[in-house]
């Protein structure tokens, strides 16, 4: 019987209320041995993956997703999930990011609500693929 994976946690640095144009970093944490962390948004099919996982403590690993310049479209609910072969974890609780008008700061281009202004750390297109040797590409993939 495989043990259940603990739920990940999510936090935001420096906080969850961010001035327009400022930066924010989402921090996802899970157990050691995590291969991939994924940052998701509510009601969206889009996501960001990273395999840049570091050890935060002897029993915990983490990944960081940074948005360099927050826009209105970044406001919303975020959550983490991780892949520890061969299983995915449950999702973390939601964390709500609020974006406030920056007082007297430089103007920043607005993004309409619902648009895809996501973390700047963009994974490669094959981030969804099996983590297998290069020869995997020689194996035909089919649905039937």
């Amino acid at each position: 019987q495989e043990e259940d994976l603990p739920r990940p946690s999510i936090s935001a640095e420096p906080g969850t209320v961010i001035p327009l144009g400022s930066h924010v970093t989402f921090v996802c944490r899970g157990p050691v041995g995590v291969q991939t962390f994924r940052l998701e948004r509510d009601s969206r099919s889009t996501y960001n993956d990273t395999e840049d996982v570091s050890q935060a403590s002897p029993s915990e690993s983490e990944a960081r997703f940074r948005i360099d310049s927050v826009r209105e479209g970044n406001a919303g609910l975020y959550r983490c999930i991780y892949y520890k072969p061969p299983k995915w974890s449950e999702q973390s609780d939601y964390l709500e990011l609020l974006v406030k008008e920056s007082s007297g700061g430089p103007d920043s281009p607005d993004t309409e609500p619902g648009s895809s202004a996501g973390p700047t750390q963009r994974p490669s297109d094959n981030s969804h693929n099996e983590h297998a040797p290069a020869s995997q590409g020689l194996k035909a993939e089919h649905l039937y």
């Epitope: 996501y47 995915w88 194996k139």
Partner: antibody, heavy 113, light 110 residues
Framework: ESGGGLITPGGTLTLTCTAS????????MNWVRQAPGKGLEWIGY?????KTYYANWAKGRFTISKTSTTVDLKMTSLTAEDTGTYFC??????????????WGPGTLVTISS | ELVLTQTPASVSEPVGGTVTIKCQAS??????LAWYQQKPGQPPKLLIY???RLASGVSSRFGGSGSGTEFTLTISDLECADAATYYC????????????FGGGTEVVVK
């Protein structure tokens, strides 16, 4: 896809999609349908350890589930409007579960008395 | 509710010509738009994702552009094999949607 065929109105049907060459756990596995002579209609998808999203019209009557190599679509209270070809499709390329880069051939479902 | 409107519903062009298909989203979806080609009796085939990125193995005669709410698929140097129905699909929202696909455009090659 398998499990299609003729079924009477009000019935229940389960379609199965089998993957070969990859593990469905690592992907967003979608179901899409197409009525005869009509356009494509997204039903929903499953990903990770059985997270699901459905189109508004499919909620409650359609259920997607999976194993490591198969994805099922259970359909209940079927009506003539559910007649069509049902496709399973793999999503996940380009960081969206809705970018569907691999499709099954489809299975025909006919609802008629 | 996010709706995709495709125009025209049908278009006919000669071999060697160019076809332009438009897809309009009822709200901004950034660059999260995909295009598919479907021939009779076959499943759809992914052509373009993220509005302008060519899917693996797809001819460079197919091109996508646009962002926000207005998107375009262009097929240049038309071939007989391009006769098919083309669909756009929003690839951002999976919650509170009726359908992720546009209504389709039939391309006839003369």
């Amino acid at each position: 896809e398998s499990g299609g065929g003729l079924i009477t109105p009000g019935g229940t049907l389960t379609l199965t999609c089998t993957a070969s060459g990859f593990t469905v756990t690592r992907y967003y596995m979608n179901w899409v349908r197409q009525a005869p002579g009509k356009g494509l209609e997204w039903i929903g998808y499953i990903y990770a350890s059985s997270k699901t999203y459905y189109a508004n019209w499919a909620k409650g009557r359609f259920t997607i589930s999976k194993t490591s190599t198969t994805v099922d679509l259970k359909m209940t209270s079927l009506t003539a409007e559910d007649t069509g070809t049902y496709f399973c499709a793999r999503g996940g390329v380009g960081n969206s579960g809705l970018n569907l880069d691999l499709w099954g051939p489809g299975t025909l479902v006919t609802i008629s008395s | 509710e996010l709706v995709l409107t495709q125009t025209p519903a049908s278009v006919s062009e000669p071999v060697g010509g160019t076809v332009t298909i438009k897809c309009q989203a009822s709200q901004s979806i950034g660059s999260w738009l995909a295009w598919y080609q479907q021939k009779p009796g076959q499943p759809p085939k992914l052509l373009i994702y993220q509005a302008s990125r060519l899917a693996s193995g797809v001819s460079s005669r197919f091109g996508g552009s646009g962002s926000g709410t207005e998107f375009t698929l262009t097929i240049s140097d038309l071939e007989c094999a391009d006769a098919a129905t083309y669909y756009c699909q929003q690839a951002e929202y999976s919650g509170d949607v009726e359908n992720t696909f546009g209504g389709g455009t039939e391309v006839v090659v003369k």
